[in-house]
Amino acid sequence: TMAIWRSNSGSNTLENGYFLSRNKENHSQPTQSSLEDSVTPTKAVKTTGVLSSPCPPNWIIYEKSCYLFSMSLNSWDGSKRQCWQLGSNLLKIDSSNELGFIVKQVSSQPDNSFWIGLSRPQTEVPWLWEDGSTFSSNLFQIRTTATQENPSPNCVWIHVSVIYDQLCSVPSYSICEKKFSM
């Protein structure tokens, strides 16, 4: 069964191509209510009435998933838990189409990076998606940020069109994904 969320698309617009955020400085673990204040509005089909969507308000729909671009800063682990609070997971990129969609969204925020659901325990162990599935570098390459001072960047974020490894403790924004079934 598919949950249908009804929302007024009039408020689900982008301003100057940037995601709106009323809570950019909330660095603490968000509550359910504060999460709703710290996410980007949906880039929805522009209709004046009420539309039916398989996604909750403020989530963006693309193909068979809903996406939420969170504008609260958190570690990778904190971001993962924030997505869980909303019944979702950190982004898992399954296809080049999906990657293109995500790049288009985050490229409108060139100053920001977004955690995705890829991590590893340490450099000797392969990258793993949050759901336990294997990572294939056929889809994208992960550009390393490792230095002698920071030798263990074991989480992954996307910045504009490039995907980097990064220290998991660095506060960043994040992308939650909720798959739906018709």
């Epitope: 325990p121 000797e124 793993l128 336990g132 599935s133 294997t134």
Partner: antibody, heavy 118, light 107 residues
Framework: QVQLVQSGAEVKKPGASVKVSCKAS????????IHWVRQAPGQGLEWMGW????????NYAQKFQGRVTMTRDTSISTAYMELSRLRSDDTAVYYC???????????WGQGTLVTVSS | DIQMTQSPSSVSASVGDRVTITCRAS??????LAWYQQKPGKAPKLLIF???SLQSGVPSRFSGSGSGTDFTLTVSSLQPEDFATYYC?????????FGPGTKVDIE
Amino acid sequence: QVQLVQSGAEVKKPGASVKVSCKASGYTFTDYYIHWVRQAPGQGLEWMGWINPNSGDTNYAQKFQGRVTMTRDTSISTAYMELSRLRSDDTAVYYCARNSGSYSFGYWGQGTLVTVSS
Amino acid sequence: DIQMTQSPSSVSASVGDRVTITCRASQGISSWLAWYQQKPGKAPKLLIFGASSLQSGVPSRFSGSGSGTDFTLTVSSLQPEDFATYYCQQAYSFPFTFGPGTKVDIE
């Protein structure tokens, strides 16, 4: 639903080889590592290694290096674990398990008892 | 290899009891730890992954905590079906290793 079904019990002589199969269903076989874990009678769990069903890449515990071979046949969603030069202390239940979050083992086969006896 | 130790090795308890099992890694493993329950003649069952995340379908009376080298599995109110052996497993480095197990039996 996710299911892993293993081949039946085997009795082998010391020095022989055994090949255990693990047929997966209910998910995309190539998306998740398959691990092999064994348990000797009355003992704890011992990780033997894994195979990436997509690439065929393997990672074996040092203890089994040179004696174990993990393979897969993606056309029938089946993973295999072959252990050679069997000894009596290889007598154990051999499990396949599908990888889950944080490299945990979320789904397990029913186990295959391999008895090594002369 | 990372050695995993568990304590106690066995514990006798009654239905309704709160039971705590500890697991210690010989070196830091961050949160890359899982807990399993195994009953005689059965395959292990995943309870907790990532040190504290409850596997889908597992009752909420099970909880995990800890990070680094010291971890805990807690059963808040033991039920008859919880009498079993519990194992921890580290997934921080190869080879992945398990603790020796803790047997929870009826007092």
